[in-house]
């Protein structure tokens, strides 16, 4: 075999295979449950119909120091196109109910898989 | 007052490498998403991709993820766009810009023209 | 990958009210795709009007709103004055990248 330059670099993620990812992400998380996750944390909860992925970063950003949901924010935060930080509350218009963090995994999973179910992966 | 400076007019050859500079100033580039966009001579605007500064993640849209890399400089404040295997469809006036919630896409570098020509 | 479509050109009076459209090829357009509105003028740089829908940009003229109607993104130019006339593009995020639209130039007359 020839190596023929350098590694190319990998494809842009399509849309449904970015959607596919973080809802197996999600499944992992629920499905590796064991303690209560993240401490028992809770986060404001959304509305899934309104600018869900931004929302749904700006909540989880704020907790810290929970190893099992790492990823899942680093996958929100390319599926938002400004750039999020703890404490800001842009897309997150409501603010007047807090979940557990499992909760508001599970809500978000059941969404993201209707989404998908549908076809909707914009 | 926020201000993105972009680097001067290229006039390149097919084949070859062109870095654009963009240099802030008014704000900490760490804090906003970098997003650069094309326009061709007379045509509408192609998004390019995006840049974190803050740690170099980056979007790509995907033609043209396999030649063009972005990245940032946090200690002068300046964000690049590099573009390779440049050809004559190339040839177009690239931005840089700053998006947020607040200020989608609210500012623009001046824009650089890059003339691709044998 | 997703087309955005919009009409070529449009017309208003001056003080009219003209609304502009954003189509995407892949359904319905929703607030998941922060819709954007963007400004451009003959040899000049582009300035972002609307983003996230109907957030509208800094310094940019109340007369600008932006909505979703039926299932398009839509930039109402209420009141229209001589200096709106210009092109103006829409861009849709798609999940991990923008696809922004075709244009549409507004003429003022």
């Known amino acids: 075999l020839t190596c023929l330059g350098g590694f190319a670099s990998p494809g842009p993620v399509p849309p449904s295979t970015a959607l596919r990812e973080l809802i197996e992400e999600l499944v992992n998380i629920t499905q590796n449950q064991k303690a209560p996750l993240c401490n028992g944390s809770m986060v404001w909860s959304i509305n899934l119909t309104a600018g869900m992925y931004c929302a749904a970063l700006e909540s989880l950003i704020n907790v810290s120091g929970c190893s099992a949901i790492e990823k899942t924010q680093r996958m929100l935060s390319g599926f938002c196109p400004h750039k999020v930080s703890a404490g800001q509350f842009s897309s997150l218009h409501v603010r007047d109910t807090k979940i557990e963090v499992a909760q508001f995994v599970k809500d978000l999973l059941l969404h993201l898989k209707k989404l998908f179910r549908e076809g909707q992966f914009n | 007052e926020v201000q993105l400076v972009q680097s001067g007019a290229e006039v390149l050859k097919p084949g070859a490498t062109v870095l654009i500079s963009c240099k802030v100033s008014g704000y900490t580039i760490t804090d906003y998403y970098m997003h650069w966009v094309q326009q061709a001579p007379g045509k509408g605007l192609e998004w390019m991709g995006r840049i974190d500064p803050e740690d170099g993640e980056t979007k790509y849209a995907p033609k043209f993820h396999d030649r063009v890399t972005l990245t940032a400089d946090t200690s002068t404040d300046t964000a690049y766009m590099e573009l390779s295997s440049l050809r004559s469809e190339d040839t177009a006036v690239y931005y840089c810009?700053?998006?947020?919630?607040?200020?989608?896409?609210?500012?623009w570098g001046q824009g650089t023209l890059v003339t691709v020509s044998s | 990958q997703a087309v955005v479509t919009q009409e070529p050109s449009l017309t208003v009076s001056p003080g009219g009210t003209v609304t502009l459209t954003c189509r995407s090829s892949t359904g319905a357009v929703t607030t998941s795709n922060y819709a954007n509105w963007v400004q451009q003028k003959p040899g000049q740089a582009p300035r972002g009007l609307i983003g996230?829908?109907?957030n509208r940009a800094p310094g940019v003229p109340a007369r600008f709103s932006g909505s979703l109607l039926g299932d398009k993104a839509a930039l109402t130019l209420s009141g229209a004055q001589p200096e709106d006339e210009a092109e103006y593009y829409c861009a849709l995020w798609y999940i991990n990248h923008f696809i922004f639209g075709t244009g549409t130039k507004v003429t003022v007359l």
């Open positions: 996230g829908t109907n």
């Open positions: 810009t700053r998006y947020d919630y607040y200020g989608p896409f609210a500012y």
